[in-house]
C-alpha cells in the first residue's frame, strides 16, 4: 500500500533535475521536509510549511528549491547536478493526524558516452582501438565482416565516476581488411550506437 | 464534555458485513482524525486505520486494507467502519478515538466504550 | 512499521511498592519538529484505553503524579512511585511518529 508515490529519476550530469512526492489519500501535511538518505542517518535539506515558506538548509542553498509548493505534492529541483547528488531522497509529509508519512525517490546522474575510434598497422598485425567513457560503465562490441577475429578489452575506472571501456580488434592479416568496414558498438542505457572506420592503407 | 458513543454488539454471520459508528460530542468533529482499533480476546492493540473528517480522506494498515472501511458524516459529527467478509479472526472488540489535527498534545486522547464484533454462524 | 517492544509481559507488585515498564522502538520516535509522539496507556478489566502520560512525560489532568514517563529516542520508562488497587490492568506504549502509529504488547500489572 503506497502513503506516498514517487518516481525514480536519471539525469544527464550538469543539468537540472526534479524529484516529485505526491502524498495520497486526500491527506495534507502540516510541514513537507526532503532529507538526503546517508549511511549514518539522514541530512535534512528544505522543509516548506505555510507559517514558514521555504527553509533550505545552508549546505543546499544554491544547489536546491522547492519548485513546487505544496503540502499534499511537493517537487524538489536541484539546478546543476554533480555525481554528489546522486542517491536516494527521502520526503516527509507531517500531519497531527497520521504521522510522519514518507517516501522516497532516488536520482541517478549519467554521463553520455565519449567515443573514439581508430587504427594503427604494426608490422603483420593491425590494431583498431574503440575507447567509450560513460556512466554508468558502457559496454563496447564489434561487428566485423568475417568471424574469428580476435579482441581484447580493459575497463578503468576515472576518479570523476565514469569509467572507460577500451577494446582493442586484433586482426593478423590486415591486407585482407584493406578498404572494409568495422563497425563499434557502445551500448549505454539501452541504447546501441554504432561508430564506423573503414581501413586505408597507411 | 467530549464523548464518542460507539453503537452496540454484532453477532453476524461469516462472510457478512458489519457498519460500526462513533457519535461525537463535545468538540470539533473537523478538528480532529478519527482513528480505529482493533482488539482480539486477550490480545494487544492493533491500529487499522484514520479517517480525516474535512475530506473524507482514509488511510489504511496495510494488514485491513480491503477489510475496513472508513467514512464519516460531518452532520451528524460521525464515524463509521464497515467490515466486510467477515471471518472468525474477525471477532474483536473495535474502539474509536480522536487524534489532532492540529494539536501535539491530542493524540489518542479520547476513545469510544468499544463495539464487541462476534462472528459465527 | 516501527516495533514498539515492552518489557516485562507481566508484572507482580505489592501494593505501596514501586513498578516499572520498559518500551522500545525499533526506530528514533523523535519527529522532525523535535516533539516525541510516544503516549502510555492503562487498559483496565472490561474498559477502553485511557490516556495516562502524552509526549514521553506530560501527565495528562487527573492522572495522579505517582506516575512518571521518561525516555528519549528509542528508550522509554513508564514508573508508577507505589502502586495502588486502581493500578492494576494492561499498559501500553504508542507511538505515533511514524506511520503507520504502533502499539507495544501490553504489560499486565497484578497487584500482589
Known amino acids: 500500500q503506497v502513503q506516498v508515490v514517487t518516481q525514480d529519476e536519471r539525469e544527464q550530469l550538469y543539468t537540472p533535475a526534479s524529484l516529485k512526492c505526491s502524498l495520497q489519500n486526500a491527506q495534507e501535511a502540516l510541514i513537507v521536509t526532503w532529507q538526503k538518505k546517508k549511511a549514518v542517518s539522514p541530512e535534512n535539506m528544505v522543509t516548506f510549511s505555510e507559517n514558514h515558506g521555504v527553509v533550505i538548509q545552508p549546505a543546499y542553498k544554491d544547489k536546491i528549491n522547492i519548485t513546487q509548493l505544496g503540502l499534499q505534492n511537493s517537487t524538489i529541483t536541484f539546478w546543476n547536478i554533480t555525481l554528489e547528488d546522486e542517491g536516494c531522497y527521502m520526503c516527509l509529509f507531517n500531519t497531527f493526524g497520521f504521522g510522519k508519512i514518507s517516501g522516497t525517490a532516488c536520482l541517478t546522474v549519467y554521463v553520455q558516452p565519449i567515443v573514439s575510434l581508430h587504427y594503427k598497422f604494426s608490422e603483420d598485425h593491425l590494431n583498431i582501438t574503440c575507447s567509450a567513457t560513460a556512466r554508468p560503465a558502457p559496454m563496447v562490441f564489434w561487428k566485423v565482416p568475417r568471424s574469428g577475429i580476435e579482441n581484447s578489452t580493459v575497463t578503468l575506472s576515472h576518479p570523476n565516476g565514469t569509467t572507460s571501456v577500451t577494446s582493442i580488434l586484433h586482426i593478423k592479416d590486415p591486407k585482407n581488411q584493406v578498404g572494409k568496414e568495422v563497425i563499434c558498438q557502445v551500448l549505454h542505457l539501452g541504447t546501441v550506437t554504432d561508430f564506423k572506420q573503414t581501413v586505408n592503407k597507411g | 464534555e467530549v464523548q464518542l458513543q460507539q453503537s452496540g454488539p454484532e453477532l453476524v454471520k461469516p462472510g457478512a458485513s458489519v457498519k460500526i459508528s462513533c457519535k461525537t460530542s463535545?468538540?470539533?468533529?473537523?478538528?480532529?482524525?478519527m482513528h480505529w482499533v482493533k482488539q482480539s480476546h486477550g490480545k494487544s492493540l492493533e491500529w487499522i486505520g484514520g479517517?480525516?473528517?474535512?475530506?473524507?480522506?482514509?488511510l489504511y494498515n496495510q494488514k485491513f486494507k480491503g477489510k475496513a472501511t472508513l467514512t464519516v458524516d460531518k452532520s451528524s459529527s460521525t464515524a463509521y467502519m464497515e467490515l466486510r467478509s467477515l471471518a472468525s479472526e474477525d471477532s474483536a472488540v473495535y474502539y474509536c478515538?480522536?487524534?489532532?489535527?492540529?494539536?501535539?498534545?491530542?493524540?489518542?486522547?479520547?476513545w469510544g466504550q468499544g463495539t464487541s464484533v462476534t462472528v459465527s454462524s | 512499521d516501527v516495533v514498539m517492544t515492552q518489557t516485562p509481559l507481566t508484572l507482580s507488585v505489592t501494593i505501596g511498592q514501586p513498578a516499572s515498564i520498559s518500551c522500545k522502538s525499533s526506530?528514533?520516535?523523535?519527529?522532525?519538529?523535535?516533539?516525541?509522539?510516544l503516549n502510555w496507556f492503562l487498559q483496565r478489566p472490561g474498559q477502553s484505553p485511557k490516556r495516562l502520560i502524552y509526549?514521553?512525560?506530560k501527565l495528562d489532568s487527573g492522572v495522579p503524579d505517582r506516575f512518571t514517563g521518561s525516555g528519549s529516542g528509542t528508550d522509554f520508562t513508564l514508573k508508577i512511585s507505589r502502586v495502588e488497587a486502581e493500578d492494576l490492568g494492561v499498559y501500553y506504549c504508542?507511538?505515533?511518529?511514524?506511520?503507520?502509529?504502533?502499539f507495544g504488547g501490553g504489560t499486565k500489572l497484578e497487584i500482589k
Open positions: 463535545g468538540y470539533t468533529f473537523t478538528e480532529y482524525t
Open positions: 509526549l514521553v512525560s
Open positions: 526506530q528514533s520516535l523523535l519527529d522532525i519538529d523535535e516533539k516525541t509522539y
Open positions: 479517517v480525516n473528517p474535512n475530506n473524507g480522506g482514509a
Open positions: 504508542w507511538q505515533g511518529t511514524h506511520f503507520p502509529q504502533t
Open positions: 478515538a480522536r487524534r489532532s489535527n492540529y494539536r501535539y498534545d491530542d493524540a489518542m486522547d479520547y
